[in-house]
């Protein structure tokens, strides 16, 4: 039903979902420090502007009694349940920040009369794409999906003379949010990766990927997996792997290997790490500090949530124009704005894009190296290291279809 | 305190050659990565080619692939960019640009590099291709 939102007569109000259920197990104290930071800066910024409004944030907190696992395999009714609180406290602000777990915010999309934007740090699988008024601020799966695609395609770089069109997909069950609808994306056989490949096989017990890494008849010598490196050296360990074997393993929101003492450990030659482009200023933020790089993005993501109201806010103020309408819930999207660590873009549908970074590890000085770039916002590949020093053979990577087994 | 200076723009006719240089000072090429990019009238600024701290990885906007050269003299503290087979379209203002690397990343590469605060810039040098 229509709430009416607290949201005129300059003063601006956000509501920030605070649930239990999180794409991210981050403390909420952590989160409502992002939040108020980019407060500060908000109302900065609308000051310098001559804006003389009130921008606040309500924090609406589920009880946290039914809704108690803390991932987000129950956050599907929590999401429903926050906002009949907002409904009856008459309570909803201007924008609605989180939820974060896909289910949560594909559930309230559909059961919602949306006339109000939505600001996502998560919502990561491919059933929250294409949503009129929601805007992700971390890396979707679709767009990991044509990363993908777009590299498999190509065969004209000097490491990379192979168009692929077979891979292998790890996928056991444990993931974190992220990665479980990454995955979920490339297992399903509607998308467009399942699409563009010939042959696609999901693997989901340790064992299966273990059988792989030598067996003289598998079907694809690449297999995509997603996680740490700890995770993958739990896996694999230390066993033999076939030298045309290429693991592709992707690691988003971790900045570890851009680290200058970082060395790679021996059993991620094989490997193919594939993350963004790390922040800079954020190392010495009050609200990241004592953050893990993956915690710190999804804070930044709550951060830059608010300050992108903010940029929506300042545009609609100084048109004259009235924030409450279908026009301001429709505007969060096809826009450039300031984010607390550089400039965030976002695409025709509200989803952030980035510098995507695929990275080896040099058999020489066993340090990772940037291999290529890939920018989301035009789907291109930039090759960086036109020689790499590959483990592989000719410094090449390999055919995805070996002619005669391991060679 | 890092400062760039460009030099070697011109007018040049349509399939000519220029080569641009890049003096700078205040920082050490082994922790910076070094690049050229370029701004037409009404257009963004958009990335040309960069080198790397180490002085091997260069990376190239396809437009210039095959005719355009980055280099760099790390003796005299200069980046070059040799340009041949010059057309209209690579008429533009040219900016000399430096980053830190942090570890084996250059913020140069990043899609959003021309808007990034922690990037250093020259003045620019203007490069005019009549055909």
């Known amino acids: 039903s229509q709430v009416s939102q607290n949201c005129h007569n300059g003063s601006y109000e956000i509501s920030v979902l605070m649930m239990g259920n999180s794409a991210f197990a981050e403390p909420l104290k952590n989160l409502e420090d992002a939040v108020n930071e980019g407060l500060e800066i908000v109302r900065g910024r609308l000051q310098n502007a001559g804006l003389n409004v009130t921008v606040n944030a309500t924090f609406m907190y589920s009880d946290g009694l039914i809704h108690n696992s803390g991932d987000c395999r129950s956050s599907t009714c929590e999401g429903l349940d926050l906002l009949r609180k907002i409904s009856n406290a008459q309570r909803m602000g201007c924008v609605l920040i989180g939820p974060s777990c896909t289910y949560s915010t594909f559930q309230m999309y559909l059961d919602t009369e949306l006339s109000y934007p939505m600001i996502s740090a998560g919502s990561f699988g491919l059933s929250c794409d294409y949503k009129e008024t929601l805007t992700r601020l971390m890396s979707p799966a679709r767009k990991l999906m044509y990363f993908l695609v777009n590299f498999w395609k190509t065969n004209d770089l000097p490491f990379k003379t192979y168009s692929w069109s077979t891979s292998y997909v790890y996928k056991n069950g444990t993931e974190t949010e992220d990665c479980f609808w990454y995955l979920n994306a490339l297992e399903a056989s509607v998308s467009y990766f399942s699409h563009e490949l010939g042959f696609k096989v999901v693997l989901r017990q340790d064992k299966e990927f273990q059988d792989i890494l030598m067996d003289h008849n598998r079907k694809s010598n690449v297999i995509i997996m997603c996680g740490g490196p700890e995770f993958l050296y739990k896996l694999k360990g230390d066993r033999a792997v076939a030298e045309d074997i290429v693991i592709i393993l992707v690691d988003l929101f971790n900045d570890q290997y851009f680290e200058d003492n970082v060395t790679a450990p021996d059993y991620m030659k094989n490997v193919l790490v594939l993350t963004l482009s790390p922040g800079n200023s954020l190392l010495n933020s009050s609200f990241s500090r004592n953050l893990s790089p993956t915690k710190r993005d999804f804070a930044l993501a709550y951060l830059n949530g608010i300050l992108l109201f903010g940029h929506m806010l300042k545009i609609f103020l100084e048109n004259g124009e009235n924030i409450t309408t279908p026009k301001f819930a429709h505007a969060f999207r096809n826009l450039t704005f300031e984010g607390y660590d550089g400039p965030v873009t976002l695409d025709d549908w509200g989803d952030v894009d980035s510098t995507m970074v695929l990275l080896y590890t040099s058999v020489d000085t066993k340090k990772y190296k940037v291999l290529l770039t890939y920018d989301t916002h035009v789907n291109k590949t930039y090759p960086v290291d036109m020689s790499p020093t590959f483990t592989w053979k000719n410094s090449k990577l390999p055919n995805d279809i070996t002619g005669r087994g391991p060679q | 305190q890092v400062h760039l200076v460009e030099s070697g723009g011109g007018s040049v006719q349509s399939g000519g050659s220029l080569r641009l240089s890049c003096a700078g000072s205040g920082y050490t090429y082994s922790t910076h990565c070094m690049g050229w990019f370029r701004q037409a009238p009404g257009k963004e600024r958009e990335r040309v080619a960069t080198?790397?701290?180490?002085?091997?990885?260069?990376h190239y906007a396809d437009a210039v692939k095959g005719r355009f050269t980055i280099s760099q003299d790390n003796a005299k503290n200069t980046l070059y960019l040799q340009m041949s087979s010059l057309n209209p379209e690579d008429t533009a203002m040219y900016y000399c640009a430096a980053a830190e690397h942090r570890g084996a990343w250059c913020p140069l590469w990043d899609r959003s590099a021309p808007l990034l605060a922690h990037i250093h810039w020259g003045q620019g040098t203007q490069v005019t291709v009549s055909s």
């Open positions: 080198i790397d701290k180490d002085g091997r990885t260069s």
